[in-house]
């Protein structure tokens, strides 16, 4: 099926940019691995590149406003031509729960204390207003809440007391258009504008000013432009040639606004001064190769002795790594395929451990399954040996750092029944359903 | 001492899937994972998940085929095994660790006691 095919992929936002055009199969669109694809406009954007997993969403709102509640967050395997590690096919979600609290306690109402007495009325003639007030302590409000209604009401109030008004202007209302929109017309352009003495109209008993001055002023317009003339487009230029030596790329004719060229401020062209095609090369971009991550640390030996375990002899061990993906004679990979260190082997040495501190909670678990669970621990930790951090293993060669490799067997005193592991599990509360974020937006 | 109990084992053919679990009367270890032993082979080691972190690691021979997971409340370790082979056929085998969980050092090379009694998984056409 044909794709709309784009120039980048933004890993921040997943959303893809630079629109190359529609009508091409996802093949040809991702001969360039560098380019991203939709299915549809304001669809999933997946990049041509092998896929991967997104970067973890921000953790959505806590399911409750108050109280203990649970979050999600997700990301998806983005990509094409492959699948993410563990077998994931691109588009796939995977979840993570965790528990959250906004605010450790609900807001409760309040209630109010009787009313106050009235205050006096708020003019000394014709008809005001008056006001009392009550108080939100009637018991107080707790933890945010509120008291409902209203502190204060009013209600009108007559002074029995006639008052004078004396006429004022309201503000002028607008200059009318002016009669002609360029110089040069059949009519001298003038505008006029009007206001009223009704801001206040002024009273009869007792009797009011009038309003000072005209109620009508008229002006000639000045300023003027001499009248437009449009724009007019001339003919398309030649075809630019295909900017790109592999994949996709787009050629562009332009034309000119000035057939005639616009006067006295008339409109441009309407329309776009360049258009586009897509060009395509058939050729597949070079892929450089990318390091996978370090593999683990080869046991900790010494050439020509059985074992160093537990004693204070350093060894060397090793760690590699495979370069992937370079294709089309990109480029290989920088830097070294193999990492050497020194180290001391403390694999399965009897040491004296300490009970650790308590560790935060963990991820609820399983995150879209029922009655999703976290938990926390104290480990028993070895005290690792006062070995000397650094040795000279070569004459003349200097000092070299030397690193503890190993699993060790700590012991420690019992508690709560266990030797090794004491943990706490508990229930995650208001748990949020599981929903593609896709899907919620159609 | 923690007492392992293996179920799930069986006969399948080549291409199926079997799901095996642990049940663990206890929780005082490091780690839990699955080893396998065919006739006339040593022991070796399949896949295991920290308890601290929830980690997890697999032998090349069964990367994206085989996934470890864990039931907090039932106190019971899984492994998933699809596109199940013949050289996959051996008596499986849950044990626990208790060497400590050194950052970066996968946990088959831990100090693994407190063996079950076995499920045996046979694949054949």
């Known amino acids: 099926d044909p794709v709309l095919c784009f120039t980048q992929y933004e890993e921040s936002s997943g959303k893809c940019k630079g629109l190359l055009g529609g009508g091409v199969s996802v093949e040809d669109c991702c001969l360039n691995t560098a380019f991203a694809y939709q299915k549809r406009s304001g669809g999933l954007c997946q990049p041509c590149r092998s896929p991967r997993w997104s970067l973890w969403s921000t953790w959505a709102p806590c399911s409750v406003t108050c109280s203990e509640g649970s979050q999600l967050r997700y990301r998806r395997c983005v990509g094409w031509n492959g699948q993410c590690s563990g077998k994931v096919a691109p588009g796939t979600l995977e979840w993570q729960l965790q528990a959250c609290e906004d605010q450790q306690c609900c807001p409760e109402m309040g209630g109010w204390s009787g009313w106050g007495p009235w205050e006096p009325c708020s003019v000394t003639c014709s008809k005001g207003t008056r006001t009392r007030r009550r108080a939100c302590n009637h018991p107080a409000p707790k933890c945010g809440g509120h008291c409902p209604g209203q502190a204060q009401e009013s209600e009108a109030c007559d002074t029995q007391q006639v008052c004078p008004t004396h006429g004022a202007w309201a503000t002028w209302g607008p200059w009318t258009p002016c009669s002609a929109s360029c110089h040069g017309g059949p009519h001298e352009p003038k505008e006029t504008r009007s206001r009223k003495c009704s801001a206040p109209e002024p009273s009869q008993k007792p009797p009011g000013k009038p309003c000072p001055g005209l109620a009508y002023e008229q002006r000639r317009c000045t300023g003027l432009p001499p009248c437009p003339v449009a724009g007019g487009w001339g003919p398309w230029g030649p075809v630019s040639p295909c900017p790109v030596t592999c994949g996709l790329g787009q050629t562009m004719e332009q034309r000119t606004c000035n057939h005639p060229v616009p006067q006295h401020g008339g409109p441009f062209c309407a329309g776009d001064a360049t258009r586009t095609h897509i060009c395509n090369t058939a050729v597949p971009c070079p892929v450089d190769g990318e390091w996978d991550s370090w593999g683990e640390w080869s046991p900790c030996i010494r050439r020509n002795m059985k074992s160093i375990s537990c004693q204070e002899i350093p060894g060397q061990q090793s760690r590699g790594r495979t370069c992937r993906g370079r294709k089309f004679d990109g480029h290989r990979c920088a830097g070294q395929q193999q990492d050497i260190r020194h180290c001391y082997s403390i694999q399965h040495c009897p040491l004296k451990g300490s009970w650790s501190e308590w560790s935060t909670w963990g991820l609820c678990m399983p995150p879209c399954g029922p009655n999703p669970t976290r938990a926390r621990q104290r480990l028993c930790t070895p005290l690792l040996p006062k070995y000397p951090p650094t040795v000279s293993m070569v004459e003349g060669q200097g000092e070299k750092n030397v690193t503890f490799w190993g699993r060790p067997l700590p012991r420690c005193e019992e508690l709560q029944g266990q030797k090794l592991v004491v943990e706490e599990k508990r229930p995650c509360l208001h748990v949020p359903a599981c929903k593609d974020p896709e899907e919620e937006e159609l | 001492q923690v007492q392992l109990v293996e179920s799930g084992g069986g006969l399948v053919q080549p291409g199926g899937s079997l799901r095996l679990s642990c049940a663990a009367s206890?929780?005082?270890?490091?780690?839990i994972g699955w080893f396998r032993q065919a006739p006339g082979k040593e022991r070796e080691g399949v896949s295991c998940?920290?308890?601290?972190?929830?980690?997890?690691y697999y032998a090349d021979s069964v990367k994206d085929r085989f996934t470890i997971s864990r039931d907090y409340a039932k106190n019971t370790v899984y492994l998933q095994m699809n596109s199940l082979k013949p050289e996959d056929t051996a008596v499986y085998y849950c044990?626990?660790?208790?060497?400590?969980?050194?950052?970066?050092?996968?946990?088959?090379?831990?100090?693994?006691?407190?063996w079950g009694q076995g499920t045996q998984v046979t694949v054949s056409g």
């Open positions: 206890g929780s005082d270890y490091y780690a």
């Open positions: 998940m920290s308890r601290t972190d929830g980690s997890t």
């Open positions: 044990g626990l660790d208790r060497s400590y969980p050194t950052g970066g050092i996968s946990c088959l090379f831990g100090d693994f006691g407190s």
